[in-house]
Interface confidence: low
């Protein structure tokens, strides 16, 4: 499977909410011995590999934000810790995987990475990630609502796999 990032850039005004989205593409095994982990973190555009560095989102680490579920299940964080920080990550039955950030501030600007790991028990893992930029703006040049910029076909297959 692959991870697509439908939008590579989100430009939002301060105070707005935004939902960053990744999507699983391709065949997804739904067997009983397969489990998915999905999470979000901030990163920087490294010279070698984007998303290799894992920084917290609003002081929450990728551990705090991770979801785990079998192939047939949907999942969301819903726990108090994330919600207290104005965050919620969620996943549906259709391969969509998102994090919602409420009441954006300028400090939220940066590179965000989604990571999906397929674990096959007794076998090796398969890891893929996607990256997108969030720009939070203030002042007269800021949009009134979030503006999203679709990924190019190349960017939307913005993946690394192992």
């Amino acid at each position: 499977f692959k991870v697509a990032t439908p939008y590579s850039l989100y430009v939002c005004p301060e105070g707005q909410n935004v939902t960053l989205t990744c999507r699983l593409l391709g065949p997804v095994d739904k067997g009983h011995d397969v489990t998915f982990y999905k999470t979000w973190y901030r990163s920087s555009r490294g010279e070698v590999q984007t998303c290799s560095e894992r920084r917290p989102i609003r002081n929450l680490t990728f551990q705090d934000l991770h979801l785990h579920h079998g192939g047939h299940q949907a999942a969301n964080t819903s726990h108090d810790l994330a919600q207290r920080h104005g965050l919620e990550s969620a996943s549906d039955h259709h391969g969509n995987f998102s994090i919602t950030m409420r009441n954006l501030t300028l400090l939220d600007s940066g590179l965000y990475c989604c990571l999906v790991v397929e674990i096959r028990h007794h076998h090796s893992e398969h890891r893929v990630h996607g990256a997108m930029e969030l720009q939070v703006q203030t002042g007269k040049d800021a949009p009134s609502n979030c503006v999203v910029y679709p990924s190019s076909s190349q960017d939307s297959e913005n993946i690394t796999a192992a």
Epitope: V48, Q49, H66, V117, I119, A162
Partner: antibody, heavy 120, light 107 residues
Amino acid sequence: QVQLVQSGAEVKKPGSSVKVSCKASGGTFSSYAISWVRQAPGQGLEWMGGIIPIFGTANYAQKFQGRVTITADESTSTAYMELSSLRSEDTAVYYCARSSYGWSYEFDYWGQGTLVTVSS
Amino acid sequence: DIQMTQSPSSLSASVGDRVTITCRASQSIATYLNWYQQKPGKAPKLLIYAASSLQSGVPSRFSGSGSGTDFTLTISSLQPEDFATYYCQQNHNRPITFGQGTKVEIK
């Protein structure tokens, strides 16, 4: 702060088994892989296998397959490693180590180590 | 299995020296490469993850680089507490494998 506390040193006879425990505190237990890594005297580090407690299924290095059993008890936040058919070359310090996120095998927290001596 | 080969196996250096340790993987592991420090009688300590990311609480004199098959751990200015054995480890595929270690000794 996450802490991994292992059981005490063991002296065993060749052919017997040993079971080492690793009790976790200070963090979520179920969602993080616990691995066992051993180190023979004066030697390097060797990964034996690992388990993510919430899944309940362990993965083992081929070298130890059939001789090692890794289990986890979520109710007590304790992982166990049992090694059977012991031989003298199994004399080593056995460490439990926690992965820094659920499915990864980069180890950010380690137990203090348990010395297992196999001697007749 | 992926074989990890470190060089040198040991080195002697003085406080303040710049020290470089290399690690080579038998096949490409992208940046799934971690570095540990171990002192006698103690458990290893994670220094660098994902080839170049500094683990929280680790001094900035430690840095890592590389991708694919060739990786480097650099200590920019060796301190007395840095004399130890250093291990690389790949977590690209199971089984997880470590390098044989590099012992950094006082000259």
